[in-house]
């Protein structure tokens, strides 16, 4: 069964900067990745970025840079311009559309006890959907 993993990392040097890493574990080719926060895409979540392997990358503030890391994983850098970061208690969700498997989504957040610079371990898959 395909799986999606999510890691949320606070940058050690900038406490207002976070990076979300997401990956797809499974066969098939990825046709689209959607990253959202506050919940799954289309279910109360707000889009942060859309990464298409051919068309490029579209991102919404406070996303700063979305990039493919490998053929099946992406990273999204976020920067909070406010005094205190809202990211620490936020859920981030990644949805991978792949052919021929369909869509798979998982969510994760920064553990409350995380030290800056340390990433959360790969999140168990609390929301795993095949559309």
């Amino acid at each position: 069964t395909p799986e999606v993993w999510v890691q949320v990392q606070m940058e050690a040097t900038e406490l207002s900067s976070f990076t979300v890493h997401c990956g797809f574990l499974g066969p098939g080719s990825i046709s689209l990745v959607t990253v959202s926060w506050g919940g799954p895409d289309g279910a109360g979540g707000t889009k942060l970025a859309v990464l298409h392997p051919e068309l490029g990358t579209r991102q919404w503030a406070p996303a700063r840079q979305a990039r493919w890391e490998t053929q099946s994983s992406i990273s999204l850098a976020l920067e909070d311009s406010g005094a205190s970061s809202p990211f620490a208690n936020t859920t981030f969700c990644c949805k991978f559309a792949s052919f021929p498997e369909g869509s798979w989504e998982s969510c994760g957040s920064l553990p409350p006890s995380s030290d800056p610079g340390l990433s959360a371990p790969p999140t168990p898959v609390p929301i795993l959907r095949a559309d």
């Epitope: 889009k47 392997p53 051919e54 490029g56 990358t57 579209r58 979305a66």
Partner: antibody, heavy 120, light 113 residues
């Protein structure tokens, strides 16, 4: 053929708002995001934002986020860009442009431009 | 935001000669997934909107004469006009179409010597 026809020139006072329209024809209107780009006199090009005509989803440049509103009227295949709290630095030609089918941010068809002059 | 820097600011070339315009980006525009560089070139004549010439660094837009060619990868790109024609007098802009917000170079004014 693809055509983007914009509304006419505007003269506005500082602090006022302006709403520019862009009517599209010659292609499947809901299938392409529409972008707005401006060019101050003798200057370069600056991206303002984009709107998805199929659902009204917008994406704005941070520099304009608090002052710009983009809307769409699918019944007339028209998109609108409203810029508020105008200042003299907003004097520019404003263009609507359609994204290229092969990539999100290359712009393959442009309107003729709308000159917005902000002057007291 | 990705910063685009063009050079030179202006260029005078004789008719029939080669014109070369350079563009540098503050970060790589190479998409590791499809190995394409997300860099576009536009031509703008006085009183007209910009016209897309090249995208993905080297793909010519349909209808664009083959004397226009784009090259480069990563952060360094070039637009070449192999044999300058009178109608090529214009301002040329590069633009990254890699990610939001798309950003443009400052422009290069091309004139006839």
């Amino acid at each position: 053929q693809v055509q983007l026809v914009q509304s006419g020139a505007e003269v506005k006072k500082p602090g006022a708002s302006v709403k520019v329209s862009c009517k599209a024809s010659g292609y499947s209107f809901p299938s392409y995001w529409m972008h707005w780009v401006r060019q101050a006199p003798g200057q370069g090009l600056e991206w303002i934002g984009e709107i998805n005509p199929s659902n009204g989803l917008t994406n704005y440049n941070e520099q304009f986020r608090n002052r710009v509103t983009m809307t769409v009227d699918t019944s007339t295949s028209t998109v609108y860009m409203e810029l508020s709290s105008l200042r003299s630095e907003d004097t520019a030609v404003y263009y609507c442009a359609r994204h290229h089918g092969s990539t999100y941010y290359a712009l393959d068809s442009w309107g003729q431009g709308t000159l917005v002059t902000v002057s007291s | 935001d990705i910063v685009m820097t063009q050079s030179p600011d202006s260029l005078a070339v004789s008719l029939g000669e080669r014109a070369t315009i350079n563009c540098k980006s503050s970060q790589s525009l190479l998409n590791s997934i499809n190995q394409k560089n997300f860099l576009a070139w536009y031509q703008q004549k006085p009183g007209q909107p910009p016209k897309l010439l090249v995208y993905f660094a080297s793909t010519r837009e349909s209808g664009v004469p083959d004397r226009f060619s784009g090259s480069g990868s990563g952060t360094d790109f070039t637009l070449t006009i192999s044999s300058l024609q009178a109608e090529d007098v214009a301002v040329y802009f590069c633009q990254q179409h890699y990610s939001t917000p798309p950003t443009f170079g400052g422009g290069t004014k091309l004139e006839i010597k």
